[in-house]
Amino acid sequence: APVRSLNCTLRDSQQKSLVMSGPYELKALHLQGQDMEQQVVFSMSFVQGEESNDKIPVALGLKEKNLYLSCVLKDDKPTLQLESVDPKNYPKKKMEKRFVFNKIEINNKLEFESAQFPNWYISTSQAENMPVFLGGTKGGQDITDFTMQFVSS
């Protein structure tokens, strides 16, 4: 069977939504009303990996686009990017590790930890309109907590 994928949107703990910023970057900003339609809809795939009650391995693609969030080293630093893939081969149950995030939910907090780089998380800045990035600190200035809204296909 193919991998099961469900559509969702994400907001950080300050209620900032994620939108496209150019072809290969996401940014976080507050949206209201009709502007909410700008927010990115992810296709979240439940992929192979170590799983527990609080931790589920997922891949985050952009709905109806052959783009996936991936984690790679750039200048020796773990970096978040949007990577283009062959739509004939993706998504799949056994995703390469750079595409895999551990979706961790504890006490109303949802985090996305890179499987490739443990303790590095999808992060947003406190400031408006800044890029979504991979951050190596939790509980600091940067935001690593999200809420997720599933949406019908």
Partner: antibody
């Protein structure tokens, strides 16, 4: 014994609000995704709301989106459904059920609480 | 969304009979299918998930099979306590939807 008990149903006028509660016992509530499923009189089943075990994930079908809000209090082992702008078609028995988006099925159900929306 | 169509909508059978209910999805649901039993005035009860896995405590006379878009629920030897309405439900894509139900009566 694993148990879910709903309360808060009743008769309400169109456009008004109602808040349902579901009390759980016999299992570790905070470890389970939860849902509300309704059944109109003499009809089938419709999943109307979902919340993840910690409360960070939610889902509503288009029929109730923007009108219903699901929430939970893990410290009190209780699930809630806030129903606003009620319509006649929201009439039915509302069941609290264990399960949701990830697992996909509902393995424990409450006895249901009836909601009637009528002027 | 994916629509689920059950057939028949009602059926009568005798104690000891083999009973079969079918559920057809409007698209491939890859075995992400569940069956429930709802006895009159009661809440639904999970019987089968993942198309063929029996839920805990469910008698072995109940079984499920199928793949793709077509699924079958079978009671190998009907018992009086099986009088109920049976529902299928898929969980492949959101929204997860239920079939309209099959009402089973004893003749």
């Amino acid at each position: 014994e694993v148990q879910l008990v709903e309360s808060g149903g009743g008769v309400v006028q169109p456009g008004r609000s109602l808040r349902l509660s579901c009390s759980s016992s016999g299992f570790i509530f905070s470890r389970y995704d939860m849902s509300w499923v309704r059944q109109a009189p003499g009809k089938g089943l419709e999943w109307v709301a979902y919340i993840s075990h910690g409360g960070a994930g939610t889902y509503y079908p288009d029929t109730v989106k923007g009108r219903f809000t699901i929430s939970r209090d893990n410290s009190k082992n209780t699930l809630f459904l806030q129903m606003d702008s009620l319509r006649a078609e929201d009439t039915g028995v509302y069941y609290c059920a264990r399960g949701g988006v990830y697992k996909g099925y509902f393995d424990v159900w409450g006895q249901g609480t009836p909601v009637t929306v009528s002027s | 969304g994916i629509q689920m169509t059950q057939s028949p909508s009602s059926l009568s059978a005798s104690v000891g009979d083999r009973v079969t209910i079918t559920c057809r999805a409007s698209g491939n649901i890859y075995n992400y299918l569940t069956w429930y039993q709802q006895t009159p005035g009661k809440a639904p009860k999970l019987l089968i998930y993942n198309a063929k896995t029996l839920a805990e405590g469910v008698p072995s006379r109940f079984s499920g099979s199928g793949s793709g878009t077509d699924y079958t629920f079978t009671i190998s030897s009907l018992q009086p306590e099986d009088i109920a309405t049976y529902y299928c439900q898929h969980f492949w894509k959101l929204p997860y939807t239920f079939g309209q139900g099959t009402k089973l009566q004893i003749t």
